[in-house]
Interface confidence: low
């Protein structure tokens, strides 16, 4: 686990002709805010693919009013870092997307208007725990200067935040082969699981499954005393078993200073030079308080009762996260009814409705039959948002405009012959059957005569209608 941090230094018009004077439109003053999106790997991903590593939104910057006579300087920016917490291992390779948004504060119907001003996408390699990386990127006529880094959160350490620390057991030093755990000198690295049977006293491992021997010991499980051993060239805590030195780090090896602090060795110890916003022996304590305005998106800041948190943000509806930096996925609440598609536009939700429905949540069922006539005596029927006509006999199709063959469905039973008729159809029954569809057998002693075809019709001719 850890945090990716992005610090925006400046955003303004790039060099060269055609640089814009102001980010604001003619509608009046505006202010800027930033969105950062992290995606794993170095592959070119679609812009709309999810920010799988996380995303964050900055606070709104100060209001900017265009001064038409003067070229735009670096624009007033939101204060503070953009922080994107990550739960799992830091991937090392990632795509960084930084969006600059403009919020127009003129008289807008329905509140402020948002628009994307610039977007930079860069694929990067970065180890956790390293120093700030600085970058300058151009997006159209705009130039963005920023720094970023990834840092682990205890107990995770290492370039991928996958190694864990544990409190050290011995008061004097870490156990055999275990280094002091940066960035906390009073903790030791949690040992990896060594090869089964590896001597606890004389062996250690840096990778799971291995068994490396301390000086003076040998064998696959470090059980065999070595006849001779040289302890030269090694530094670190003294081994009580052999009087030799176990390989170990110098005070600044692995950089014990957290949060981008730089380490300098002092006699027998080290000292951290911390960046702004962090302090403590190892720069491990964040100096952010409510006075620094850490709560984004209108969150209310209160001093934390928990000693480990100097402040707590109470987030407004629609936002969450320790700094109210994460927008709640409002579409997960399925606000759109009747199969509407939910779109979270950032400043608002929008429902894209299916045909036959309307309204902010597609809650309104349109009158499908309004203004829609069914031809040839058909009747309009509403249902499920779909317009449908119930057609008169002899007609079919969506609007009853197509002539239908009433005999196509072979309605006459027992071999009866079907004759299309202006009022529908007539069945001429085979001997021994009767009824409008020839469905009834005639009494054995009765005789049934085949009725003559209506004038002008030939039997079985469906093409001719009166």
């Amino acid at each position: 686990a850890g945090v990716f941090e992005l610090q925006i230094h400046s955003f303004g018009p790039g060099p060269g002709p055609g640089a814009p004077r102001s980010p604001c439109s003619a509608r009046g003053p505006c202010r800027l805010f930033f969105r950062v999106c992290l995606k794993p790997g170095l592959s070119e991903e679609a812009a709309e693919s999810p920010c799988a590593l996380g995303a964050a939104l900055s606070a709104r910057g100060p209001v900017y009013t265009e001064q038409p006579e003067a070229p735009a300087p670096d624009l007033p920016l939101p204060n503070g870092l953009l922080q994107v917490p990550f739960r799992d291992a830091w991937p090392g390779t990632f795509s960084l997307i930084i969006e600059t948004w403009r919020e127009e504060l003129g008289d807008q119907i329905g509140g402020p208007a948002w628009s994307l001003l610039a977007r930079v996408t860069r694929r990067r390699r970065l180890a956790a725990g390293g120093p700030w990386a600085r970058d300058i990127q151009r997006a159209g006529a705009w130039e963005l200067r920023f720094s970023y880094r990834a840092r682990c959160e205890l107990p995770a350490v290492g370039t991928a935040c996958t190694r864990l620390c544990r409190p050290r057991s011995a008061p004097s030093r870490c156990g055999p082969g275990l280094r002091p755990c940066a960035p906390l000198e009073d903790e030791c690295e949690a040992p990896p699981v060594c090869r089964a049977g590896c001597s606890l006293e004389h062996g250690f491992c840096e990778q799971p499954g291995e068994c490396r021997c301390l000086e003076g010991w040998t064998g696959p499980l470090c059980m065999v005393p070595a006849s001779t051993s040289s302890c030269l060239g090694l530094r670190g805590p003294s081994s009580a078993t052999t009087g030799c030195l176990v390989p170990g780090p110098g005070p600044c090896d692995g950089n014990p200073c957290a949060n981008g602090g730089s380490c300098s060795e002092t006699p027998g110890s080290f000292e951290c030079t911390c960046p702004r916003g962090f302090y403590g022996l190892r720069c491990e304590v964040s100096g952010v308080t409510c006075a620094d305005g850490p709560c984004f998106n209108g969150g209310l800041c209160v001093g934390g009762a928990d000693p480990d948190s100097a402040y707590i943000c109470h987030c407004p509806p629609g936002f969450q996260g320790s700094n109210c930096e994460k927008r709640v996925d409002r579409c997960s609440l399925q606000p759109c009814r009747n199969g509407g598609l939910c779109l979270d536009l950032g400043h608002a939700l929008r429902c894209r409705c299916r045909a036959g429905f309307a309204g902010p949540r597609c809650e309104h069922n349109l009158d499908d039959c309004a203004g829609r006539a069914c031809a040839n005596g058909g009747t309009c029927v509403e249902g499920g948002g779909a317009h449908r006509c119930s057609c008169a006999l002899g007609f079919g199709g969506r609007d009853c405009r197509e002539r239908a063959d009433p005999c196509a469905a072979r309605p006459c039973a027992h071999g009866g012959r079907c004759y299309a008729h202006f009022s529908g159809l007539v069945c001429a029954c085979a001997p021994g059957y009767m009824g409008s569809r020839c469905e009834f057998p005639v009494h054995p002693d009765g005789v049934s005569a085949l009725p003559a075809a209506p004038p002008g019709l030939r039997p079985g001719d469906p093409q001719r209608y009166l």
């Epitope: 000292e271 030079t273 302090y279 022996l281 304590v285 100096g287 000693p307």
Partner: antibody
Framework: QVQLQESGPGLVKPSQTLSLTCTVS??????YYWSWIRQPPGKGLEWI?????????NYNPSLKSRVTISLDTSKNQFSLKLSSVTAADTAKYYC????????????WDQGTLVTVSS | EIVMTQSPGTLSLSPGERATLSCRAS???????LAWYQQKPGQAPRLLIY???SRATDIPDRFSGSGSGTDFTLTISRLEPEDFAVYYC?????????FGQGTKVEIK
């Protein structure tokens, strides 16, 4: 309102250990850094060291070998021990709270003058 | 360590005048880690400015701080009788915390 009150002897013999205690009232000792600063007569301020509520300490390298700052959260107190004192350690000793975020000293006590003399 | 040098050592002014005190660091100091204090005889120092330019609680607005990098300034726009004292700057960009040697503002 946070208040700090020092206690300890005003006179210490050379080579002995200077011991001072600072009691915090009006607020919890937890979640802040607490520091000691001294000022020799007629001179400027010198930072001695600090301690965090979890016991982490940082000392001025010029005094590091002789300084111990400790904390008793149950009594809302923190203490200074300066060993092997000499006349050069004669000063007014202040305890102070460090403002979270700017590392400035926002609350001070009135100070105790400690004289090192036989 | 970062050495903080204040100038002038003594500033002789009359009430109502403007006082400008300088503090120079031997290496760059982040804005967030520079503070100014006022100390009157027999009293503890009192925090005036933190973060180079933010006034501490209950500090009158005639006190203002500015500067960045290695050069910082404390300005008292109009000296009041109670402002005559010694002023110290202090940094904690790099351990150890260090103070300037002080500037004494005295009545002319």
């Amino acid at each position: 309102q946070v208040q700090l009150q020092e206690s300890g002897p005003g006179l210490v013999k050379p080579s002995q250990t200077l011991s001072l205690t600072c009691t915090v009232s009006g607020g919890s000792i937890s979640s802040y850094y607490w520091s000691w600063i001294r000022q020799p007569p007629g001179k400027g301020l010198e930072w001695i060291g600090y301690i965090f509520y979890n016991g982490i300490t940082n000392y001025n390298p010029s005094l590091k070998s002789r300084v111990t700052i400790s904390l008793d959260t149950s009594k809302n107190q923190f203490s200074l021990k300066l060993s092997s004192v000499t006349a050069a350690d004669t000063a007014k000793y202040y305890c102070a709270r460090i403002h979270s975020g700017s590392f400035s000293f926002d609350y001070w006590d009135q100070g105790t003058l400690v004289t090192v003399s036989s | 360590e970062i050495v903080m040098t204040q100038s002038p050592g003594t500033l002789s002014l009359s009430p109502g005048e403007r006082a400008t005190l300088s503090c120079r660091a031997s290496q760059s100091v982040s804005r967030g880690y520079l503070a100014w204090y006022q100390q009157k005889p027999g009293q503890a120092p009192r925090l005036l400015i933190y973060g180079a330019s933010s006034r501490a609680t209950d500090i009158p607005d005639r006190f203002s701080g500015s500067g960045s990098g290695t050069d910082f300034t404390l300005t008292i726009s109009r000296l009041e009788p109670e402002d005559f004292a010694v002023y110290y700057c202090q940094q904690y960009d790099t351990s150890p915390i260090t103070f300037g040697q002080g500037t004494k503002v005295e009545i002319k």
